[in-house]
């Protein structure tokens, strides 16, 4: 499927890898190697999480593998490619005017960064525009060592960002989640996400969807009317990728937002969200920063229950349990608590009718030199069918004008020992955030909601 | 709804301090946003000078740095402009805004509520 | 520093029509652009940011346009309230750093 794109888009080919500068604004690319795509796939998949610094659980909890580790794993593992998507990028402390010891994963992370670049291995980075983070030079940095920086218009073309935050190694390997290229996600914010090593046909398939952000970071790009079938998906929620994860039967497939960026077979991330929890009959357990079944940064503010909705109808027609963890931190919006209000206001036990929500608070501690820190910032959820690991917060515009990845999986408990499945592992770290005691109910809170730590 | 009003003295002679309080009504200074102060110099150029955050750190305008202070009492709900050794320059009128939403991964700063100014002259 | 420049100071123009106002970055600030309305009284209110995205309250008669280093705000069928001085303001570094303004009156 290697067709070029359209003139106005750029000299890209959606299954090349950008490698290094040209002799004039175009890119000199190369397709992948072919011995790399010849290797037989035996896809593993990896939790992944960040737990901030003072934030102790209690002593014998479950983990997922630190984000820290594994990303340094994934660029360890790296022979030809890594390409990254990521709303902003600050790995080092002066990004931020901080001096603070926490930072220092993040700036090794450059640091491996670089000598990947030194060791002819291409990086691609698709970015967004509008951004944070505007005084970071680690683009300027990687950029001028050979990456190749794309900063995608989606201010422009959709009035929302590139939000998505993920990575493909190789044509082969995967990171995905919650986590933007930022140290203070490696100490400082609590995260989540997923690694999927030698699973191809995913990677791949994630691929496209990077391809669509870099075909729109050339100038005057325009949204196509219709993506080329070469951007085309054919794993989504119909069709999702079936295959043997460690020895687990598993079905996976990647979803994508807006509407907008989604070529012919790619699942809308809102359409896998709503399945995901359409097929619950036992629980949902999702844990988001910011919910608000409203539009978010446009005006006038609109109305938008659709997820609200759907959390409803599981919990009140099909006796589903519900239960919401959402984000609180010195950098949230005070409005969200009249809707999570709303929204538990729904449970009646009397009438089999579930519904529980918490505020997560992350200790502030003698971190509060740290801005926008000290925050769960996952976006996840778990049924007793399926795991959905996401990059977005629930809201509209995350859904309507902004990027961002779903990947949901479905694991088989069959023949493996119970609490092996994807989803009993997330559930069970749902289970570990939401009785912790960092997890406190809308009631527990004080009046002015102010998310202030009362330990 | 927010509102924002300056206050102090009118006449400042040079090389003295200035000070002016802003006083916010209908927000709290600690919950979020960026506290602004920002003047109008005769002929109308606007220049910022500098905000104290929600969490009580600051910047500065470059311009200003060694003779600006802006600091907060959050039990009144103000916070307070200082600008030491002025001169006839520094005649102005004198606005504190605020600047956000600071909410988290938004990437959109606007000034969205201003007060009403303070004229401020430095003669002797 | 960015320096901002409008370089007109002043324009006029009837009451039911059009105007445009321009206002030219000394950089690349890559969208990170606002438009405040000054009143004669000296109120100042926020009108657009992020270049062209309208604040809430604002009438749909304002727009506002533009990339890079040029950008322009314009002000559709013209009425007796829109009678202010425009600034520019770049958010895209600190320091935060405005146009010097344009003022506008009716013929």
């Known amino acids: 499927w290697q067709v070029r794109c359209p003139p106005t888009w750029g000299q890209v080919q959606p299954r090349d890898v950008p490698r290094s500068w040209g002799h004039g604004s175009s890119l000199a690319l190369e397709p992948l190697e072919a011995e790399v795509r010849k290797q037989r796939d035996s896809c593993q998949l990896v939790l992944v999480e960040s737990i901030p610094q003072d934030l102790p659980f209690a002593a014998g909890s479950l983990s997922a593998q630190p984000l820290g580790q594994a990303w340094l794993q994934l660029l360890d593992t790296a022979q030809e490619s890594v390409h990254v998507a990521s709303y902003y990028w600050s790995l080092t402390g002066p990004d931020i005017g901080v001096n603070d010891s926490s930072s220092q994963l993040g700036e090794a992370l450059l640091q491996k960064l670089q000598q990947l670049l030194g060791r002819n291995i291409s990086l691609a980075v698709a970015t967004s525009s509008p951004t944070l983070a505007r005084k970071s030079t680690d683009l300027q940095v990687l950029a001028a060592r050979g990456a190749q920086v794309r900063r995608v218009p989606m201010g422009r073309l959709t009035r929302g960002v590139l939000h998505s935050k993920f990575w493909v190694v190789d044509g082969r390997h995967i990171y995905m989640g919650s986590a933007n290229m930022d140290w203070r996600s490696l100490t400082q914010v609590k995260e989540l996400g997923a690694v999927i090593y030698n699973c191809s046909h995913l990677a791949q398939d994630l691929e496209k969807t990077f391809q669509t952000y870099w075909v729109l970071g050339v100038p005057k790009a325009v949204l196509p009317k219709t993506w080329p079938q070469n951007f085309s998906s054919h794993i989504n929620r119909f069709q999702p990728f079936q295959g043997l994860f460690d020895g687990v039967p598993t079905t996976a497939y990647f979803s994508a937002s807006p509407p907008a960026l989604c070529p012919q077979g790619r699942t809308p991330d809102l359409e896998a969200l709503l399945a995901v929890m359409g097929s619950a009959q036992e629980f949902i357990y999702a844990s988001v920063m910011e919910y608000f079944p409203t539009t978010r940064f446009s005006h006038p503010r609109r109305y938008w229950p659709v997820l609200d909705n759907a959390l409803r109808a599981a919990a009140f027609s099909k006796g589903v349990r519900v239960r919401l963890l959402v984000s609180c931190g010195l950098n949230t919006d005070p409005t969200m608590f009249p809707y999570l209000r709303s929204l538990q206001a729904l449970s009646n036990p009397a009438a089999n009718v579930s519904v529980d929500v918490k505020v997560f608070i992350v200790p502030v501690g003698n971190h509060s030199n740290i801005p926008f820190s000290r925050v769960n910032h996952s976006k996840f959820m778990v049924t007793e069918k399926a795991a959905y690991i996401g990059t977005s917060n629930w809201s509209e515009d995350y859904f309507s004008s902004t990027t961002g990845v779903g990947l949901v999986v479905t694991q088989s408990p069959g023949a493996q020992p119970a609490g092996a499945t994807v989803q009993e592992q997330l559930r069970q770290l749902f289970e570990r955030d939401w009785s912790s005691r960092y997890a406190v109910g809308l009631d527990g809170q004080a009046p002015g909601q102010d998310c202030v730590w009362q330990g | 709804d927010v509102q924002l009003q300056e206050s102090g003295p009118g006449l400042v002679k040079p090389s003295q301090s200035l000070s002016l309080t802003c006083s916010v009504t209908?927000?709290?200074?600690?919950?979020?946003y960026y506290w602004s102060w920002i003047r109008q110099f005769p002929g109308n150029r606007l220049e910022w000078m500098g905000y104290i955050s929600y969490d009580g750190s600051n910047n500065y305008n470059p311009s200003l740095k060694n003779r600006i202070s802006i600091t907060r009492d959050t039990s009144k709900n103000q916070f307070f402009l200082k600008l030491n050794s002025v001169t006839t320059e520094d005649t102005a009128t004198y606005n504190c805004?605020?600047?956000?939403?600071?909410?988290?991964?938004?990437?959109?700063?606007?000034?969205?509520?201003w007060g009403a100014g303070t004229t401020v002259t430095v003669s002797s | 520093d960015i320096q901002m420049t409008q370089t007109t100071s002043s324009l006029s123009a009837s009451l039911g029509g059009s105007v445009t106002i321009s206002c030219r970055a000394s950089q690349d600030i890559d969208n990170y652009l606002n438009w405040y309305q000054q009143k004669p009284d000296g109120t100042v209110k926020l009108l657009i940011y992020y270049t062209s995205r309208l604040h809430s309250g604002v009438p749909s008669r304002f727009s506002g346009s533009g990339s890079g280093t040029d950008y322009s705000l314009t002000i559709s069928n013209l009425e007796q309230e829109d009678i202010a001085t425009y600034f520019c303001q770049q958010f895209n570094t600190l320091p935060r750093t405005f146009g010097g303004g344009t003022k506008l009156e009716i013929k």
């Open positions: 805004a605020r600047e956000g939403p600071l909410y988290y991964g938004n990437p959109y700063w606007y000034f969205d509520v």
């Open positions: 209908g927000y709290s200074i600690s919950s979020h």
